[in-house]
């Protein structure tokens, strides 16, 4: 998977009036990394691993960047015409990636009330709009404002692309997130289901990177997809991931079932506790 840095900012309006402040989260390699603390007006690391990325350096730069981006987004929301009464949101998601072949990608996406209406490839400066008429109207509105804004010149988009990649490389240089491997802890539990059946659940936690194979096997053969239930692979807040898989089996046949896990070239098999 590529290394990635993802900025997620949201601003709100009420009855056409843009609210002060903004919400901001930053994800590094898919993990919650920073958030903007509105009480302290500071960028705050999310967990110990995030603190370790910058070590003893301050988060002033991140605070300044998020504050500036929040201000820009509030100005953009103010220029959206025909805001109906009530609560509305404008969200900007900006992502940059560095792939294994060193190629890079960066893009910017705008959502109004949760609906995507405008995307831009920051490297090539190509703008894309979904086909709905609402998206087209919003996109023209926002795009015209961005065009008018002197800061949003062509060099500005190149700068956004370059800045995001520069920050991502800076974080990767710490070595904390760089192609590390943390093997999962695997835990199998059982619980009563209907009469004569039990549900067996296999949980993998605290692993990195996020790619993992977790599946139930009967007599050494993987069960079909539709007889198993999978949980999403989710960040656990410590810079690692967690997931689970469950299936229903007949009581008394526990010894025939094993949970198979494969992660970063290593694999293991885990029996059902009896």
């Amino acid at each position: 998977e590529p290394h990635s840095l993802r900025y997620n900012l949201t601003v709100l309006s009420w009855d056409g009036s843009v609210q002060s402040g903004f919400l901001a989260e930053v994800h590094l390699d898919g993990q919650p990394f920073l958030r903007y603390d509105r009480q302290k007006c500071r960028a705050k690391p999310q967990g110990q691993w995030a603190e370790d990325v910058l070590g003893n350096k301050t988060w002033d730069r991140e605070t300044r960047d998020l504050t500036g981006n929040g201000k820009d987004l509030r100005m953009t929301l103010a220029h959206i015409k025909d805001q109906k009464e009530g609560l509305h949101s404008l969200q900007e998601i900006r992502v940059c990636e560095i792939h294994e072949d060193n190629s890079t990608r960066s893009s910017q996406h705008f959502y109004y009330d949760g609906e995507l209406f405008l995307s831009q490839n920051l490297e090539t400066e190509e703008w894309t709009v979904p086909q709905s008429s609402r998206a087209q109207t919003l996109a023209m509105n926002v795009r015209n404002f961005l065009k008018e804004d002197a800061m949003k010149t062509k060099t500005h988009y190149h700068a956004m692309h370059a800045d995001c990649l520069q920050e991502l490389r800076r974080y990767l240089e710490s070595g904390v997130v760089l192609r590390r491997t943390v093997p999962p802890m695997v835990n199998v539990t059982r619980s009563e289901a209907s009469e004569g059946n039990i549900t067996v659940t296999c949980r993998a936690s605290s692993f990195y990177p996020r790619n993992i194979i977790l599946t139930w096997r009967q007599d050494g053969v993987s069960l079909s997809h539709d007889t198993q239930q999978w949980g999403d692979v989710l960040p656990d807040g410590n810079g690692t991931y967690q997931t689970w898989v469950a299936t229903r089996i007949c009581r008394g046949e526990e010894q025939r079932f094993t949970c198979y896990m494969e992660h970063s070239g290593n694999h293991s098999t885990h029996p059902v506790p009896s």
């Epitope: 190629s103 995307s119 490839n121 490297e123 090539t124 190509e126 703008w127 894309t128 062509k154």
Partner: antibody, heavy 120, light 106 residues
């Protein structure tokens, strides 16, 4: 209406250089990037690079970077591509194509192509 | 660079037949674009941003896909659809094109 008029076919010797042109009309020349695409006889399309006429900024496909130079003349709204140290590998049709802003604009407008033949 | 692999390289279809051309990318891309080219002419933008039809393109054409797998489909083949079709990505530099699919009419 938008038009991209490319220069006539070129016959060149190996080791020589050629400079072909793409004359743009029907739109604001400095508002859109100009891309160049290569097509060898009976083969597929290869993106060479682009130039931003407003700033002169260029982006090249690494494969073509050493022997290709893209330039523009804003006063005549013309984009140029020069190929140097020609070999038989450069024998191809070269197209200019206009970049865009919105996705709907990109690569809609193409020149008719300039055929370059490299032969001793 | 991102490599786009088109299949099939050559195919023929009867009038009224459904045709699907696929384009596989070596890494995930946001949008795929398709061009039609007939002998002796410049390429024409045919489908852009994965699924949007360029101006003048008949509604029997459609595009779909995401990530590394994309396709162009003709619901009912017509004689005028005989041409070479190229996929293209613009996710990052360098832009690349697929090797092309030559579609012939039976």
């Amino acid at each position: 209406q938008v038009q991209l008029q490319q220069s006539a076919a070129e016959l060149a010797r190996p080791g020589a250089s050629v400079k072909m042109s793409c004359k743009a009309s029907g739109y604001t020349f400095t508002s859109y990037t100009m891309h160049w695409v290569k097509q060898r006889p009976g083969q597929g399309l290869e993106w060479i690079g682009y130039i931003n006429p407003s700033s002169g900024y260029t982006e090249y496909n690494q494969k073509f970077k050493d022997k290709t130079t893209l330039t523009v003349d804003k006063s005549s709204t013309t984009s140029y591509m020069q190929l140097s140290s020609l070999t038989s590998d450069n024998s191809a049709v070269y197209y200019c194509a206009r970049g865009g802003d919105w996705d709907v604009d990109w690569f809609v407008y193409w020149g008719q192509g300039t055929l370059v033949t490299v032969s001793a | 660079q991102i490599v786009l692999t088109q299949s099939p390289a050559i195919m023929s279809a009867s009038p009224g037949e459904k045709v699907t051309i696929t384009c596989s990318a070596s890494s995930s891309i946001s949008y795929m674009h398709w061009f039609q080219q007939k002998p002796g002419t410049s390429p024409k933008l045919w489908i852009y941003s994965t699924s949007k039809l360029a101006s003048g393109v008949p509604a029997r054409f459609s595009g779909s896909g995401s990530g590394t797998s994309h396709s162009l489909t003709i619901s009912r083949m017509e004689a005028e659809d005989a041409a070479t079709y190229y996929c293209q990505h613009r996710s990052t530099y360098p832009f690349t094109f697929g090797s092309g699919t030559k579609l012939e009419i039976k």
